[in-house]
């Protein structure tokens, strides 16, 4: 089958990194500079992605693979293949239409990206607040008020970290 296919279509013999040049009797020509073909049998080579401005080159373009970009310091990637770069904020902030803004009271963000999320409501799990939340940190829930009977230890080791608002499984 491969042999018949080759007889029918000489382009199928052209490997990655080349293209089937119609102007030259369908011989396999190397991809020109700043272009690539990642599969065999291509009739054209694709233009390499250019990492410019806020984007920087993570991997150079080669004749067989496209360039890969990431973001310059102070920015982080968004979208498939890092199609966008978004400015970082500080912990305790979120990026809004008007720039980096502090998290509102009752919310926190422990990363340089993403949105402010509500503090965990300890009482939903029948627990009390052991450590108050801040703009940068979620509250730490402690034992339930009923557990704090006279003579009982008032401080217990914190439970393993979990997503705010989610009950333990």
């Amino acid at each position: 089958f491969e042999r018949t296919r080759s007889l029918q279509d000489p382009c199928s013999n052209c490997p990655a990194g080349t293209f089937c040049d119609n102007n030259r009797n369908q011989i396999c020509s190397p991809c020109p500079p700043n272009s690539f073909s990642s599969a065999g049998g291509q009739r054209t080579c694709d233009i390499c992605r250019q990492c410019k401005g806020v984007f920087r080159t993570r991997k150079e373009c080669s004749s067989t693979s496209n360039a890969e970009c990431d973001c310059t310091p102070g920015f982080h990637c968004l979208g498939a293949g890092c199609s966008m770069c978004e400015q970082d904020c500080k912990q305790g902030q979120e990026l809004t239409k008007k720039g980096c803004k502090d998290c509102c009271f009752g919310t926190f963000n422990d990363q340089k990206r993403g949105i402010c999320r509500p503090w965990t409501n300890c009482s939903l799990d029948g627990k009390s607040v052991l450590v108050n939340g801040t703009k940068e940190r979620d509250v730490v829930c402690g034992p339930s008020p009923a557990d704090l009977s006279p003579g009982a230890s008032s401080v217990t080791p914190p439970a393993p970290a979990r997503e705010p608002g989610h009950s333990p499984q």
Partner: nanobody
Framework: EVQLLESGGGLVQPGGSLRLSCAAS????????MSWARQAPGKGLEWVSG???????YYTESVKDRFTISRDNSKNTVYLQMNSLKPEDTAVYYC????????????????WGQGTLVTVSS
């Protein structure tokens, strides 16, 4: 071919003013949002200001009330008027298209100029 050419940079004393210009060609300027970014020596890039095609303007906190972005669609040019300049405004200033329309976000299809150096020093 898209081209963005910045001009107007230079040396200025603290408290002084400068107006940067960015002449655009190779695309439909009047319907494109535009932005300014800057990179201080040894620091990362910073989003400074943006202007929508309709004229709405956005600024990063540190330049609010001191910098003004504007555009002249008849001249395919965007401007950045910088007043009350401080030493910390020293940077290379870049003009860029702003296809995402989102504060602090650029996309891979955006185009960038080569930059113009602004030095604020006595």
């Amino acid at each position: 071919e898209v081209q963005l050419l910045e001009s107007g940079g230079g040396l200025v004393q603290p408290g002084g003013s400068l107006r940067l210009s960015c002449a655009a060609s190779g695309f439909t300027f009047s319907s494109s949002a535009m932005s300014w970014a800057r990179q201080a020596p040894g620091k990362g890039l910073e989003w400074v200001s943006g202007i929508y095609s309709g004229g709405s303007t956005y600024y990063t906190e540190s330049v609010k009330d001191r910098f003004t972005i504007s555009r002249d669609n008849s001249k395919n040019t965007v401007y950045l008027q910088m007043n009350s300049l401080k030493p910390e405004d020293t940077a290379v200033y870049y003009c860029a298209t702003w296809g995402t329309l989102r504060f602090g976000v650029w996309a891979e299809y955006d185009h960038w100029g080569q930059g113009t150096l602004v030095t604020v020093s006595s």
